[in-house]
Amino acid sequence: YHGCPSECTCSRASQVECTGARIVAVPTPLPWNAMSLQILNTHITELNESPFLNISALIALRIEKNELSRITPGAFRNLGSLRYLSLANNKLQVLPIGLFQGLDSLESLLLSSNQLLQIQPAHFSQCSNLKELQLHGNHLEYIPDGAFDHLVGLTKLNLGKNSLTHISPRVFQHLGNLQVLRLYENRLTDIPMGTFDGLVNLQELALQQNQIGLLSPGLFHNNHNLQRLYLSNNHISQLPPSVFMQLPQLNRLTLFGNSLKELSPGIFGPMPNLRELWLYDNHISSLPDNVFSNLRQLQVLILSRNQISFISPGAFNGLTELRELSLHTNALQDLDGNVFRMLANLQNISLQNNRLRQLPGNIFANVNGLMAIQLQNNQLENLPLGIFDHLGKLCELRLYDNPWRCDSDILPLRNWLLLNQPRLGTDTVPVCFSPANVRGQSLIIINVNVAVPSVHVPEVPSYPETPWYPDTPSYPDTTSVSSTTELTSPVEDYTDLTTIQVTDDRSVWGMTQAQSG
């Protein structure tokens, strides 16, 4: 293979890989026809002048996870064909000016996970063909104006996980081709008006995990192609009325972990493509009519872990495509019977950890496709007759941790649970709270002969009017559905956001008989 160094492996495809702690300098001689060179996990601390001089055909160079702290300005001389250069996961604090000079073909430059303290306009002034620049995981405190002015072809810029406290409104002004801009996990407290105005092709903007308190009203007005906007884990306390008005392509918006107290009607939209809206961990106390009415394609709405005590009957108007609604861990005591009436496609609803004392009999009347209902840890003593009768797809119902009153009025609910037992999975059985003689007993095995007669209604009406799937030989298979009711953060579509997905505690919505018990 034209002379492969002993500490490296060389493949027929002109790929060279040099790894191991015993390597302390760039191995020589490298095969002249090498097109890809990887130097990984070595003890190389510096790159001297022209170590790659004889491999001018090189297209990709990865020098990652080393002890590299110093690079001579001429280290990459004669690599005019190089398209991909990664220096990620090293110990670089300073980049010499002119380091990338002559790399006329360079398209991807990865400098992430180093200790860079600053960048200057002269660093990248020669990289006119650069499409991707990764600078996340460094110690940058500011970006000087002009730093990216020559990178007119740049499509992806990652500045996340640095120490940026402010951004100049001019720093991105020439990046008209930029599609992805990541500024997550910095110390930004505000973003000046106009900062993103030049980013007319931007598709993703990641601003999560900063300290942003206010959003300028027109901050995103020029970003008509924006598809993903991450604003979670900031200090945003209010949303200017027009802040999201010009985002017709948006399909993911995260606002969880802020300090939002209220949502005004029309604040979201029109966003015909928005599929997911994450608003958990805020301080929202009520939801007015039509607050989400512009979100006609919304499928996931997460409002858990707020302080919601009131939901207007028309709050969810327009959400005809909603599949998952999470309202758990709020302060709800009552729900209007029509509040979910428009949610014809709803599959999963989580209402656990509230203060619900009762549910209207028609609460799920138009929501025929429900597969999972979480009602645990509320103040429910009984449920209305027939409340679940029409829910033929229901395969998870959680009712535990409620103060069930097991007088004769509970029999219809008990019977319903038993009738639907083979196709209704639950991990914890509801337990009687009152009267005292049955406290602590499972609701579905209470001795009905000693249950206290009801003081409410002498004759218990029928419940359900007809059991599910009457007169059928077997129950349909339970359906397993991906759970989002217990998610603590959405899954971003890139890995360097360091967000996590925590799935439901049993990882199932519907349990089969074999899994249950």
Epitope: S408, L411, P412, N415, L417, L418, L419, Q421, P422, T426, D427, T428, V429, S442, I444, I445, V448, N449, E459, V460, P461, S462, Y463, P464, E465, T466, P467, P470, D471, S474, Q513, A514, S516, G517
Partner: antibody, heavy 113, light 111 residues
Framework: EVQLQQSGPELVKPGASVKMSCKAS????????IHWVKQMPGQGLEWIAY??????KYNEKFRGRATLTSDKSSSTAYMELNSLTSEDSAVYYC????????WGQGTTLTVSS | DIVLTQSPASLAVSLGQRATISCRAS??????????MNWFQQKPGQPPKLLIY???NQGSGVPARFSGSGSGTDFSLNIHPMEEDDTAMYFC?????????FGGGTRLEIK
């Protein structure tokens, strides 16, 4: 006091039908399931079906030959068996609730020509 | 269908002693964390009488000498101390899923 009173013995010819009853008292009829169970002479017990507020669930073995109905106004459950053969000769019980906590005294059916 | 196998088929126990009847299910009869296994006593010419429901809960008016235990697929009915009146047929039954099924029965008599 909870009671299930079943109709008297039946002697029918092969191929005929029979309808037996189970009248409930001492509790709210609509709050509980009523099961029907077959026991052939000197044999074990065999579950036929249940009825609850007009909804029914049958053992496949009896589907199409057993029909359960109820009359809420009189708190009475009924089971009709058709196309009878000698194998249907047995005592038929009605029982209450999912846990079969109260049983009727049984209706003896004899199928003979 | 879930098949229930009772053992022994017949059992003779001295007065005052312990009688133990076993019932094994072909698959688990647990659901909601509850075992849907019931036990019945039947005397000649009488309907069955519920003794134990949901594996270990005593039926109404059932003497304390009758107790049930078990979970999953293995269950037992214990009678202690044995009395003359306990001579009868005993059946286990699962109510986990349709069709509900009964064991073949155990004949218990005085030794």
């Amino acid at each position: 006091e909870v009671q299930l009173q079943q109709s008297g013995p039946e002697l029918v010819k092969p191929g005929a039908s029979v309808k037996m009853s189970c009248k409930a008292s001492g509790y709210t009829f609509t709050s509980f399931v009523i099961h029907w169970v077959k026991q052939m002479p000197g044999q074990g017990l065999e579950w036929i079906a249940y009825i609850y507020n007009d909804g029914t669930k049958y053992n496949e073995k009896f589907r199409g030959r057993a029909t359960l109905t109820s009359d809420k106004s009189s708190s009475t459950a009924y089971m009709e068996l058709n196309s009878l053969t000698s194998e249907d000769s047995a005592v038929y019980y009605c029982a209450r609730d999912f846990y079969f906590d109260y049983w009727g005294q049984g209706t003896t059916l004899t199928v003979s020509s | 269908d879930i098949v229930l196998t009772q053992s022994p088929a017949s059992l003779a126990v001295s007065l005052g002693q312990r009688a133990t009847i076993s019932c094994r299910a072909s698959e688990s009869v647990d659901y909601y964390g509850i075992s849907f296994m019931n036990w019945f006593q039947q005397k000649p010419g009488q309907p069955p009488k519920l003794l134990i429901y949901a594996a270990s809960n005593q039926g109404s008016g059932v003497p304390a000498r009758f107790s049930g235990s078990g979970s999953g697929t293995d269950f037992s009915l214990n009678i202690h101390p044995m009395e003359e009146d306990d001579t009868a047929m005993y059946f286990c039954q699962q109510s986990k899923e349709v069709p509900y099924t009964f064991g073949g029965g155990t004949r218990l008599e005085i030794k």
